[in-house]
């Protein structure tokens, strides 16, 4: 570690100053101060190779990556970058360190990656690795549509205020629970803004830009329904309009709704009624409840009241700031490779999240359903029994949760071997972790079961590949041992799996595989 | 050059909240993948790791104190924030703040650079 | 929660001394442990990490080993600057733990 150079990697963010930015002069920017970026040997990695933390960067920001290198003489450097190499001219600072600079201008989604430093000095070589990603912030954007009285009109206007333009719709549907899923037959869409039809048993507005689509219910307590278990619970922050509706069907037209809030009868211009007579002769009344602009004294209980049915109520809290409220521990779980298992995460949300569960660098949907008790659960069962870390996260603007799975699949090992001059090494990533045994075969042991008790070297678990662990067992190779054959079997309680090696002279080397147990 | 530095009431007394801060320089938690640990050592006992926070706002807290603490960053401030919450004699100890740096390959590393450290004395 | 068993709790050495300090966890951690030195009304200091890595500036006389469940920290040659308290830390599994200390006390 001594002899290693001292490196230090830094990050220079530069407030672009448009008119000279992508000029080649030295530096067309104003600079902020540089931050560590905390360059580190990598663990386990063949030859010297130093990391530095993720840069995380906003579209169009221009950074400089910078490497100060402590080491006598002088040094000459590659950068390589998406296979292809970039020119490296190294100078030196006032206190002698070699400075090695790589300046991004105006960061686009083709510049996110791996930057690879090749550096070269008198005394040793060695890489540097910077891995830089785009910040998620994105320029465009896309809200959740909420609702406006139309001026003098018994209708509701739904606005997004997004970018780009959204396309806003009303979905519809009469139905009740599962027949009101997006694409059910119940379901009917009016691309409009306006909806006057305000009778239906489940209203919603969706806005919908190049970002995606966002959606928002209309609340709603109906007198007709056996209530809920547990109370229902509307949330909203501070300054959002709030819309309650209060919904009965009646014999005749002989009742009448009314809406409490604490047991006070809401002040006028606070709510508006609507009614109609259905098909079959039966009277529905509708009675909105409403605030342009909520305030924490908005909290509290609304009640709908009618003369002639049991009323019901609904909380509706007022918060500050959106919340993701679950627990955030990370869980861990051993399945057998044939087991039907799912992932689940049980959350309260607001506003509604957007969620992805990752594995292995790669994105998968993210499916939420809401539970009667005002919590709402993602399940994600399409790990195909793939061990490792999975990762649920979930933002909805104003808080981020993540929460770590790792997902361990109890199977017998599987060995692959490979071999060099020096030695010969065997892997294995069965679950529990495989232990090791070396054996050679001679004409004293056909078999092989002469155990070779010298020159082995394990290194259990010693990588993790997207949380996968991995067993490796090493054999040091003796003069007397080449031409003979070894035999690594690595076993763990589901079984043992062996692979033989010749060892010979550098070259192709024939593996026989063995019998799995 | 990285620095960390806590701050925060010398003494405190039973059943109020603790506020402590770690002011950091030299890096920040804006534009690369940058963590702070809180870690806590009663007069001659063990060290005891109590929550860390990440750039990407993720959080983690010790099981035994989970339901006392809150951890929180400001970015502007390079700032990161524990709250402990009904605090007992039994909380006497010295408060450090440590760094955690996080890797594009996986790996982390804890703890290269710490603070000096903050006595907080639990007491009526 | 895993725990972390150091072991000796104390030791006494001389200067030039090899000395050995183990730490095992309860459950197995691949190579997610670090060891660190603290001296008395000091911060600790990160001697090693991912087991076996050593940080930047320490010197080499100090060495880390081992995977799974079984830790040791070797120091070479003991030095007068080395007496001090160490503690291995894993971050393999929330919450991360820290194990009791090993005092290295000179003879």
């Known amino acids: 570690n001594q002899d290693l150079p001292v490196i230090k990697c830094v990050l220079i963010n530069h407030k672009n100053n448009d008119s000279s930015v992508g000029k080649s002069s030295s530096y067309p920017m104003v600079s902020e101060s540089p931050e560590d970026l905390g360059c580190a040997l990598r663990p386990q990695s063949a030859g010297t190779v130093y990391e530095a933390a993720t840069v995380e960067v906003d579209v169009s920001a221009s950074i400089t990556l910078q490497v100060l290198v402590d080491t006598p003489g002088n040094i000459s450097c590659l950068w390589v970058f998406k296979h292809s190499s970039l020119n490296c001219q190294p100078h030196f600072d006032v206190q002698n360190r070699g400075v090695v600079s790589m300046v991004i201008l105006k960061m686009t989604e083709t510049q996110a990656g791996e930057y690879l430093l090749f550096i070269q000095s008198e005394a040793t070589n060695y890489t540097i690795v910077f891995t830089v990603s785009i910040r998620n912030t994105l320029l465009f954007t896309l809200r959740r549509p909420y609702f406006r009285k139309m001026e003098n009109q018994d209708a509701l206007v739904c606005i997004s205020e997004s970018v780009p333009e959204p396309i806003v719709e009303w979905v519809l549907c009469d139905s009740q629970g599962e027949s009101c899923k997006e694409e059910s037959p119940a379901v009917v869409k009016k691309e409009e803004k306006v909806l006057h039809e305000l009778f239906g048993t489940d209203i919603r507005c969706c806005a919908r830009n190049e970002l995606g689509r966002e959606c928002t219910r209309l609340f709603t307590i109906d007198l007709n329904q056996t209530p809920q278990t547990t109370l229902p619970q509307l949330f909203l922050k501070v300054g959002e309009p709030l819309w309650i509706r209060c919904k009965a069907v009646h014999v005749n037209h002989g009742f009448g709704l009314t809406w409490e809030l604490e047991n006070k009868a809401l002040e006028e211009g606070s709510y508006f009624e609507m009614s109609t007579y259905s098909t079959n002769r039966t009277m529905i009344r509708i009675l909105f409840a409403f605030v342009s602009s909520v305030a924490r004294n908005d909290t509290g209980y609304y009640t709908c009241s009618s003369s002639k049915h049991p009323s019901q109520s609904a909380l509706v809290t007022i918060v500050e700031k959106g919340f993701i409220n679950a627990t955030n521990s990370s869980e861990d779980y051993e399945i057998d490779q044939y087991e039907e298992f799912c992932f689940s995460v049980r959350f309260k949300a607001y506003p509604q999240i957007r969620c992805t569960w990752t594995f292995s660098r790669k994105a998968f949907p993210c499916e939420q359903k809401a539970l009667d008790d005002g919590y709402s659960v993602s399940k994600f069962c399409n790990h195909k029994h793939q061990p490792g870390e999975y990762i649920f996260h979930a933002e909805n603007g104003d808080a981020q949760f993540t929460k770590m799975f790792t997902l361990n699949i109890r199977r017998k090992p599987q060995v692959l071997a490979e071999a060099s001059a020096s030695q010969a090494s065997c892997s294995s990533d069965g679950y529990p972790l495989p232990s090791w045994t070396w054996k050679k075969c001679s004409d004293k042991s056909p078999n092989c079961t002469e155990d070779i008790p010298e020159g082995v070297w394990n290194r259990k678990a010693n990588r993790k590949v997207f949380g996968q662990w991995v067993s490796s067992s090493t054999l040091n190779m003796s003069e007397a041992m080449k031409g003979f054959l070894v035999k690594c079997c690595a076993y763990n309680s589901l079984g043992t799996s062996c692979e033989t090696i010749l060892l010979n002279s550098p070259g192709p080397f024939p593996f026989i595989q063995d019998s799995i147990s | 050059q990285v620095t960390l530095k806590e701050s925060g009431p010398v003494l405190v007394k039973p059943t109020e909240t603790l506020t402590l801060t770690c002011t950091v320089s030299?890096?920040?938690?804006?534009?690369?993948?940058?963590?702070v640990n809180w870690i806590r050592q009663p007069p001659g006992k063990a060290l005891e790791w109590l929550a860390h926070?990440?750039?990407?706002?993720?959080?983690s807290y010790s099981t035994s104190l989970k339901s006392r603490l809150t951890i929180s960053k400001d970015i502007s401030k390079s700032q990161v924030v524990l709250t402990m919450t009904n605090m007992d004699p039994v909380d006497t100890a010295t408060y450090y703040c440590?760094?955690?740096?996080?890797?594009?390959?996986?790996?982390?590393?804890?703890?290269?650079?710490w603070g000096q450290g903050t006595l907080v004395t639990v007491s009526s | 929660a895993i725990q972390m068993t150091q072991s000796p709790s104390s030791l006494s050495a001389s200067v030039g001394d090899r000395v050995t300090i183990t730490c095992r966890a309860s459950q197995g951690i691949t190579n997610d442990l670090g060891w660190y030195q603290q001296k008395p009304g000091k911060a600790p200091k990160l001697l090693i990490y991912?087991?076996?890595s050593l940080q930047s500036g320490v010197p080499s006389r100090f060495s880390g080993s081992g995977s799974g469940t079984d830790f040791t920290l070797t120091i070479s040659s003991l030095q007068p600057e080395d007496f001090a308290t160490y503690y291995c830390l894993q971050d393999y599994n929330y919450p991360w733990t820290f194990g009791q200390g090993t005092k290295v006390e000179i003879k």
């Open positions: 926070i990440f750039s990407n706002d993720e959080k």
């Open positions: 440590a760094r955690i740096v996080g890797y594009g390959s996986g790996w982390r590393l804890l703890g290269d650079y």
């Open positions: 991912a087991a076996s």
């Open positions: 030299g890096f920040s938690f804006n534009n690369a993948r940058m963590g």
